[in-house]
Amino acid sequence: CDLPQTHSLGNRRALILLAQMRRISPFSCLKDRHDFEFPQEEFDDKQFQKAQAISVLHEMIQQTFNLFSTKDSSAALDETLLDEFYIELDQQLNDLESCVMQEVGVIESPLMYEDSILAVRKYFQRITLYLTEKKYSSCAWEVVRAEIMRSFSLSINLQKRLKSKE
């Protein structure tokens, strides 16, 4: 499956929007840093089948969408930027869904890569728990925004590697 050229442009736009969501100087938030245990192994090449990679990427973007579409995120972040961010993520999801269906068929994919998908879900659960424990403070959002930017960048790198293998 060939992801459209607009897909990588959408990735870049999503990253720019994440960067623009900054509300306070991050320098005041050093003490709030947290290890979310990003599931790096799910984004390494290993013996990754393309279909598995696409499923993991889809889950990553879906969970990012979920995280940023809560009422707490709407209260903490710029709504105009959030709306643009949702549009970009929605397009990413559509692109990847088309790919998943082409690669493995819609029935098999969620079951075949359950462990990888579960690892991504648990990662986002840790992020949500952190935000809850920190009472959705400005610094907590700043830390999460930085973390999502990092994980998003790693997702983009995985997509680039997939493309180069075609």
Partner: antibody, heavy 121, light 107 residues
């Protein structure tokens, strides 16, 4: 390979201006902050300030606030440290180092080789 | 500002010795404490981050412990290349601050 390459040694007179540089390569320059550290002859390490190259947001140590300016040009992956009017007491080795920002990763894991600044009349 | 106090300021030791350097913060800094090694004419090198995590490529004879205000860097068996100055540094808050350094010399 991650590298921070600093500009060469400088010999200046008191009152002169100076801008030294730190060029990052082998990683995403805007994904890390760049910190500056001073080491006067025979002395310890002193943190001067830091910059987020993604938007040029800066923070300074109170000891250096107003004495130096930290800037960055992300288009050429370079951070700068500058003085508008040097003093003899600015004679020191200056290091840049990368910092992971708010990400859970090692602080100051890569350092530049240092720029020796000598201020003498 | 958070003050970082290292002790001792210098120490003499022999190859094979176990060496311990301590660092005390003026207020609790959690585990946001790093250790660096610096040799004359060279840039500092990160050894330990987040109080106890060994930086990639650093020999396992180096270890770090502590949290809150009291921290320790231990070299289990001193090697000839370990004679250097060691600095602790807090990254809990801005301004970031370093300890004054501990010089490890040959006995």
């Amino acid at each position: 390979e991650v590298q921070l390459v600093q500009s060469g040694a400088e010999v200046k007179k008191p009152g002169e201006s100076l801008k030294i540089s730190c060029k990052g390569s082998g990683y995403s320059f805007t994904s890390y902050w760049i910190g500056w550290v001073r080491q006067m002859p025979g002395k310890g390490l002193e943190w001067m300030g830091i910059i987020d190259p993604s938007d040029s947001d800066t923070a300074y140590s109170p000891s250096f606030q107003g004495q130096v300016t930290i800037s960055a040009d992300k288009s050429i992956s370079t951070a700068y440290l500058q003085w508008s009017s040097l003093k003899a007491s600015d004679t020191a080795m200056y290091y840049c180092a990368r910092h992971p920002g708010l990400n859970w990763a090692p602080d100051f894991d890569y350092w530049g080789q240092g720029t020796l600044v000598t201020v003498s009349s | 500002d958070i003050q970082m106090t290292q002790s001792p300021s210098s120490l003499s030791a022999s190859v094979g010795d176990r060496v311990t350097i301590t660092c005390r913060a003026s207020q609790s800094i959690g585990s946001f404490l790093n250790w660096y090694q610096q040799k004359p004419g060279k840039a500092p090198k990160l050894l330990i981050y987040f109080a106890s995590s060994l930086q990639s490529g650093v020999p396992s004879r180096f270890s770090g412990s502590g949290s809150g205000t009291d921290f320790t860097l231990t070299i289990s068996s001193l090697q000839p290349e370990d004679f250097a100055t060691y600095y602790c540094q807090q990254s809990y808050s801005i301004p970031i601050t370093f300890g004054q350094g501990t010089k490890v010399e040959i006995k």
